[in-house]
């Protein structure tokens, strides 16, 4: 067990041009607060995945009012550290998200309004017990400077907080098989203590407080033999040779405990051990109130006027979770057909199609054009066993991805000069010719061989070919 500590040093405009506008004004004073979310391993730092290592919310910073005309300075910060306690081993590699939130203190109906100012994310390696690590992250025009460290809570020590130390019982040496606890040489490594009551015959542990069962045994303390009499038990069948030794889904599968709670099986059901600040059967009730601004991503907080009554976050579309902290994984609905791969871009879904299919959801079987979509408004044409793209004006190449040079084919007749234009080409005709491609001679008496130039356009003026 231990604590991850985050110290915010400054939040303000980053270097370079384009300084951001101050988030507060005389009409709308505001104050900042921060949220940190930690995940184990070098996982994706997507904001929507749960903060499996824990999360913390800072206190509110001092109220700030912008001085008119002044550039945004470093904004006043909340006091103190953000602390994220962790119960188990420190993973050594972790991903973080640090969000800077603005609380507007104007005359909003229904209390203060919260909005996300900046979100930074990263992946780091960090040994517990080491010195403070300094970091600078940029989010748009904003810059966040901070330090962080992980420290073990006694009696845990080591880079992962998995070794336990106890004061020496004898002044000279540690007990049999136990080493001195570097760097605390006056202490000794304690033997690994499994969960209280863990069966010494059928259970074992690799980390303190854990109880893992040998094959054939189950239950929180590995005291319950797995049934071998029938493969119809609700815990699921195994191979014919071993009967039903491998447990199927248990009450803790999928972790029913919310907000970083850890689950342990009980004889009849499960039990959640909740992190600080949460309680309830599934750690769903929080000591946090709506005044703490617990709803993220624009969620609306309702109820929870005092710490004993739960608040509810009403999430905007695209977000879910007790704090609106999870983005709805719209790709889990498998909207892309025919083997297409799904991307949730936040503002939209995109399907990457396999050859042979196209369309927003890869729903069109392009047998004629065999999986070839043409870019930039081009259309697919089949012929002679091969496809080609008939490209819209201004584009060329195999998929119409290349900007064509409309003048390459020398489209202007009779010595006219060609100019590329964003919408096509323009021909500047030589004296005596007119038309979109300078194809019509102007008769000496001023009449043209085809309809006269539009009003206001003199023969010989550049004509745009669209």
């Amino acid at each position: 067990a231990g604590v991850f500590e985050l110290q915010i040093h400054s939040f303000g405009p980053g270097p370079g041009p384009g300084a951001p506008r101050s988030p507060c004004s005389a009409r709308l004073p505001c104050r900042l607060f921060f949220r940190v979310c930690l995940k184990p391993g070098l996982s994706e730092e997507a904001a929507e995945s749960p903060c499996a290592l824990g999360a913390a919310l800072s206190a509110r910073g001092p109220v700030y009012t912008e001085q008119p005309g002044a550039p945004a300075p470093d904004l006043p910060l909340p006091d103190g550290l953000l602390q994220v306690p962790f119960r188990d081993a420190w993973p050594g590699t972790f991903s973080f998200i640090i969000e800077t939130w603005r609380e507007e203190l104007g005359d909003q109906i229904g209390g203060p309004a919260w909005s996300l100012l900046a979100r930074v994310a990263g992946r780091r390696r960090l040994a517990a017990g080491g010195p403070w690590a300094r970091d600078i992250q940029r989010a748009g025009a904003w810059e966040l400077r901070f330090s962080y460290r992980a420290r073990c809570e006694p009696p845990a020590v080591g880079t992962a907080c998995t070794r336990l130390c106890r004061p020496r019982s004898a002044p000279s040496r540690c007990g049999p098989g136990l080493r001195p606890c570097a760097p605390l040489e006056d202490e000794c490594e304690a033997p690994l203590v499994c969960r209280a009551g863990c069966s010494p015959e059928h259970g074992f542990c690799e980390q303190p407080g854990e109880c893992r069962c040998l094959e054939g045994w189950t239950g929180p303390l590995c005291t319950v033999p797995v049934s071998t009499s029938s493969c119809l038990s609700p815990r699921g069948p195994s191979s014919a040779t071993t009967g039903c030794l491998v447990p199927g889904p248990g009450p803790c599968d999928g972790n029913p405990c919310a907000n970083g709670g850890s689950c342990s099986e009980t004889p009849r059901s499960f039990e959640c051990t909740c992190p600080r600040g949460f309680y309830g059967l599934r750690c769903e009730v929080s000591g946090v109130t709506c005044a703490d601004g617990p709803c993220f991503n624009g969620g609306l907080c309702v109820g929870g006027a005092d710490p004993d009554s739960a608040y509810i976050c009403h999430c905007p579309p695209g977000f879910q979770g007790s704090n609106c902290e999870k983005r709805v994984d719209r790709c889990s609905l498998q909207p892309c057909r025919n083997g297409g791969l799904c991307l949730d871009l936040g503002h939209a879904l995109r399907c990457r199609c396999r050859a042979g299919f196209a369309g927003p959801r890869c729903e069109h079987d392009l047998d004629d054009c065999a999986g070839r979509a043409c870019a930039n408004g081009g259309t697919c044409v089949e012929g002679g066993g091969a496809h080609r793209c008939s490209c819209a004006l201004g584009f060329g190449g195999r998929d119409c991805r290349e900007r064509a040079d409309p003048c390459a084919a020398r489209p202007c007749a009779h010595g006219g000069r060609c100019y590329a234009h964003f919408s096509g080409l323009v021909c500047a005709c030589a004296p005596g010719y007119m038309g979109a491609r300078c194809e019509f001679p102007v008769h000496p008496d001023g009449a043209s061989a085809l309809p006269a130039a539009p009003p206001g356009l003199r023969p010989g003026d550049p004509q745009r070919y669209l």
């Epitope: 025919n338 791969l341 199609c353 396999r354 050859a355 070839r372 979509a373």
Partner: antibody, heavy 120, light 111 residues
Framework: QVQLVQSGAEVKKPGASVKVSCKAS????????IHWVRQAPGQCLEWMGW????????EYASKFQGRVTITADTSANTAYMELSSLRSEDTAVYYC?????????????WGQGTLVTVSS | DVQMTQSPSSLSASVGDRVTITCKSS???????????LNWLQQKPGQAPKLLLY???KLESGVPSRFSGSGSGTDYTLTISSLQPEDFATYYC????????FGCGTKLEIK
């Protein structure tokens, strides 16, 4: 036109890592998958993996899992392939390739290849 | 992992000949979407591979019609109806139904 230009040849010692770059022009790498394929002297072509630069998703061949990392810098329109714990049998020409517009599984455009030699 | 076995590994032929190269997969390449993701590529010495056919028989843009492909399930064939001097190269099959696996190539040489 669509082009993939790879970084120059590299000589590495066993146990080291190599990072090969693949700069795209004529298209935005966010629109397509970038694949990496290698060819050891006199050997078969081997697909190593791909990246979807739009969101950073990657898929690796099981043979290279844990040793290869494919990344992309969309602002530079460039993809990278890093192979670690090099051994002599990693001596090969490494190619990047990209798919066709919207069809992520076709290897249509190829880089010129980067020769990586692993020798003590 | 899917294995792709190409045969022959090398082949000598003359300009004008009709040539057939086969590729056998260790499992069916028919995707659940009804398509079969088998490609053929050509590689000349010192050059990167070039896509010739995809979806078994579809000619890539700009590829001459003397190249054709056929097959289903686990057995596939590339046919060059009348060899031209520029066709002497190494040919690879590539399946992309189950990730990506190349065959080991057939080297087509001048007799």
């Amino acid at each position: 036109q669509v082009q993939l230009v790879q970084s120059g040849a590299e000589v590495k010692k066993p146990g080291a890592s190599v990072k090969v770059s693949c700069k795209a022009s004529g298209f935005n790498i966010k629109d397509d998958y970038i694949h990496w394929v290698r060819q050891a002297p006199g050997q078969c072509l081997e697909w190593m993996g791909w990246i979807d630069s739009e969101n950073g998703d990657t898929e690796y061949a099981s043979k290279f899992q844990g040793r290869v990392t494919i990344t992309a810098d969309t602002s530079a329109n460039t993809a990278y392939m890093e192979l670690s714990s090099l051994r002599s049998e990693d001596t090969a020409v490494y190619y990047c390739a990209t798919s066709s517009y919207w069809s992520y599984d076709l290897l249509v455009y190829w880089g010129q290849g980067t020769l990586v030699t692993v020798s003590s | 992992d899917v294995q792709m076995t190409q045969s022959p590994s090398s082949l000598s032929a003359s300009v004008g000949d009709r040539v057939t190269i086969t590729c056998k997969s260790s499992q069916s390449l028919l995707h659940s979407n009804g398509k079969t993701y088998l490609n053929w590529l050509q590689q000349k010495p010192g050059q990167a591979p070039k896509l010739l056919l995809y979806l078994v028989s579809k000619l890539e843009s700009g590829v001459p019609s003397r190249f054709s492909g056929s097959g289903s399930g686990t057995d596939y064939t590339l046919t060059i109806s009348s060899l031209q001097p520029e066709d002497f190269a190494t040919y690879y099959c590539l399946q992309t139904t189950h990730l990506y696996t190349f065959g080991c190539g057939t080297k087509l040489e001048i007799k």
